[in-house]
Amino acid sequence: LQDLCSNCPAGTFCDNNRSQICSPCPPNSFSSAGGQRTCDICRQCKGVFKTRKECSSTSNAECDCISGYHCLGAECSMCEQDCKQGQELTKKGCKDCCFGTFNDQKRGICRPWTNCSLDGKSVLVNGTKERDVVCGPSPADLSPGASSATPPAPAREPGHSPQ
């Protein structure tokens, strides 16, 4: 016996209450594939969620987060509060990064500054709560008479453009 329900198109459901008619999905529901015996309830983007794409009879709604929040998880399943750069979100809210750590985004955690000395380099620019340190040449590279990997550019005479 052929299962007629399997032929009901997306946007409908095979309604057993109504003798297997391929009935359009009721309001606020959808079926993204054919052969469905029920329509799925549309996701509602409420509270900290806002609608990015409306629900249709064949596809679910898609949500974003309202201003001041960002998406987490598959299909934006959660919204997490934004913090400022130089902060991280804790159970008690946004807290400044501890000394020696930084966060250059509105989300995520504070990460330790790069330890330049581990690579045998020196600190060229100090780190802040918002920015990592910038490592420069090793102290040995900066000593007088040290050979440079790239020769210095020739000095130009004033008033002359390069050839």
Epitope: C8, I21, C22, S23, P24, P27
Partner: antibody, heavy 118, light 112 residues
């Protein structure tokens, strides 16, 4: 726009058959079920049967079960309703109607008058 | 078969006044999805019927908000908050849940 256009009026003798067509346009024909409803002069509307346009399976009211055939031609986006062994009580306006929302017939044809007279 | 009983059968109304039509079903029209499968149609003189309300209380596309449907068990009501001249015709309730789908006998709304 979405519409259903039915074939013209028919005059039939008792015992004969009539076949009414309903051509759909402006939407995906195979997505929506099609129903047939009739209305005898001065009477209430009477549901006759439906066809799952995309699949072709049908369900009929018991009252017409032995005399009605609903068929469809998907390539022509057309549904047909054939009623046999006509009698005088079958004189009515016959409507096709699309089930466009859950259980609701949102688009109706203009109706086809079928007269049964000897 | 599910019997649909409408009242009144005739309803004279003054334009701008409200109107109410009742429909009672002999059995529950509650679908397993939680909706009552009850429709309201208006058939204007010389025209095909048009869908007003489906699933008991949801206005069909393009239907003015002066039309509303309510439900209580097997009792259903169509309300028109302010009747306009264009609302004249015969109003039918219908159940599309159990075969054979059945209509009420109709309520003829006319302007006083």
């Amino acid at each position: 726009q979405v519409q259903l256009v039915q074939s013209g009026a028919e005059v039939k003798k008792p015992g004969a058959s009539v076949k009414v067509s309903c051509k759909a346009s402006g939407y995906t024909f195979t997505t929506y079920p099609m129903h047939w409803v009739r209305q005898a002069p001065g009477q209430r509307l009477e549901w006759m049967g439906w066809s799952n346009a995309g699949i072709g399976n049908t369900k009929y009211s018991q009252e017409f079960q032995d005399r009605i055939t609903i068929s469809r031609d998907t390539s022509a986006s057309t549904v047909y309703m054939e009623l046999s062994s006509l009698r005088s009580e079958d004189m009515a306006v016959y409507y096709c109607a699309r089930e466009g929302v859950a259980g609701g017939f949102d688009i109706w044809g203009q109706g086809t008058m079928v007269t049964v007279s000897s | 078969d599910i019997v649909m009983t409408q009242s009144p059968l005739s309803l004279p109304v003054t334009p701008g006044e409200p109107a109410s039509i009742s429909c009672r079903s002999s059995q529950s029209l509650l679908h397993s999805n939680g909706y009552n499968y009850l429709n309201w149609y208006l058939q204007k003189p010389g025209q095909s019927p048009q869908l007003l309300i489906y699933l008991g209380s949801i206005r069909a596309s393009g239907v003015p908000d002066r039309f509303s449907g309510s439900e209580s068990g097997t009792d259903f009501t169509l309300k028109i908050s302010r009747v306009e001249a264009e609302d004249v015709g015969v109003y039918y309730c219908m159940q599309p849940l159990q075969i054979p789908y059945t209509f009420g006998q109709g309520t003829k709304l006319e302007i006083k």
